[in-house]
């Protein structure tokens, strides 16, 4: 197959790094400087990522792959590939259109970046609050006001075990 | 800023060979292909062929190998078509064009023109 | 030779239209595909090269997509300075070849 489709296309036998040139007679020529291709049988290389401005260079581009790149300090990436940078905030904190500002009561952050997400609602399952949220963390869910009865036991006891040669049903 | 410049008109006799020129700025001239593309009144484009000035490779479309020869100076920066055995099929605007970068994803488009020169052939 | 169609010779459209002229190679290019813009007075301007990719100083109510033999411009909101004739080119094999060229006139 790999012959046959030779045959029909000179530019399948140019590897990744370079390109095949159209207008020397499909030759395969190295990827100029600032290009690359990922790729065999490109036509063209593409030209390499610069980190620039508010990115930084994580890996350097080669003639068979692009540049990558990160955020600089205060920053972090969003979207595909680090495609954009977006300013961190403190803990405790969501970043609005006028800056950071502190999660509202009854909301936390425990990342530099993100939105502010509303505490758990421990009565949703039946359980009591254990520790209390701040706008840092969420709250702690402790074991429901029935579970605290005297004599109740909190200890789970050991599932059967199963015969040798029995598979689960 | 990249330019290519083209004398606006010739008048040319049947049969009497003409050479166009085209005088690159702006650019590094050897790093690039030039193009050279005729327009006939009311009608589309075609491509003749190219030319890398660093070493004078040139393509030509079969349809134009006869009539076309492509040249460059390279002291001047200038690229030269020359049409021969004129006749009035001939007489068309004739634009050169500067190739995208080497290698890269513009390599294969025209990113900048001359104004074209118009070719008249006429006795 | 690979033969590029632009099936609509010319088209009338009002200022701030959106307008879409389409092409169409007669095998697949690969993406090779480049638009351009001739004035009335022959001035020819590179718009978009390999399919969608912008031209320095080109606005961006200009865009191009497609893919294999199918190829379109879109001008998003079309100005009194957007007419003209806009011709497409395949870069992906020699010899290189246009389309016939689309005429934009203002209804």
């Known amino acids: 197959f790999e012959r046959t489709r030779s045959l029909q296309d000179p530019c399948s036998n140019c590897p990744a790094g370079t390109f095949c040139d159209n207008n020397r007679n499909q030759i395969c020529s190295p990827c100029p400087p600032n290009s690359f291709s990922s790729a065999g049988g490109q036509r063209t290389c593409d030209i390499c990522r610069q980190c620039k401005g508010v990115f930084r260079t994580r890996k350097e581009c080669s003639s068979t792959s692009n540049a990558e790149c990160d955020c600089t300090p205060g920053f972090h990436c969003l979207g595909a590939g680090c495609s954009m940078c977006e300013q961190d905030c403190k803990q405790g904190q969501e970043l609005t259109k006028k800056g950071c500002k502190d999660c509202c009561f009854g909301t936390f952050n425990d990342q530099k970046r993100g939105i502010c997400r509303p505490w758990t609602n421990c009565s949703l399952d039946g359980k009591s609050v254990l520790v209390n949220g701040t706008k840092e963390r969420d709250v702690v869910c402790g074991p429901s006001p029935a579970d605290l009865s005297p004599g109740a036991s909190s200890v789970t006891p050991p599932a059967p075990a199963r015969e040798p040669g029995h598979s689960p049903q | 800023q990249v330019q290519l410049q083209q004398p606006g008109a010739e008048l040319v006799r049947p049969g009497a060979s003409v050479k166009l020129s085209c005088k690159a700025s702006?650019?590094?001239?050897?790093?690039?292909?030039i193009n050279w593309v005729k327009q006939r009144p009311g009608q589309g484009l075609e491509w003749i062929g190219n030319i890398y000035p660093s070493d004078s490779y040139t393509n030509y479309d079969q349809k134009f190998k006869d009539k076309a020869t492509l040249t460059v100076d390279k002291s001047s920066s200038t690229a030269y078509m020359q049409l021969s055995s004129p006749t009035s099929e001939d007489s068309a605007v004739y634009y050169c064009t500067k190739s995208g970068e080497y290698g890269k994803i513009g390599y294969y488009a025209m990113d900048y023109w001359g104004q074209g020169t118009s070719v008249t052939v006429s006795s | 030779d690979i033969q590029m169609t632009q099936t609509t010779s010319s088209l009338s459209a009002s200022l701030g239209d959106r307008v879409t002229i389409s092409c169409r190679a007669s095998?697949?290019?690969?993406?090779?595909l480049n638009w351009y813009q001739q004035k009335p007075d022959g001035t020819v301007k590179l718009l978009i090269y390999y399919t969608s990719r912008l031209h320095s100083g080109v606005p961006s109510r200009f865009s191009g997509s497609g893919s294999g033999t199918d190829y379109s411009l879109t001008i998003s909101n079309l100005e009194q300075e957007d007419i003209a004739t806009y011709f497409c080119?395949?870069?992906?094999?020699?010899?290189?070849?246009f389309g016939g060229g689309t005429k934009l006139e203002i209804k």
């Open positions: 095998q697949d290019i690969s993406n090779y």
């Open positions: 702006g650019y590094t001239f050897t790093s690039y292909w």
């Open positions: 080119q395949q870069g992906n094999t020699l010899p290189y070849t």
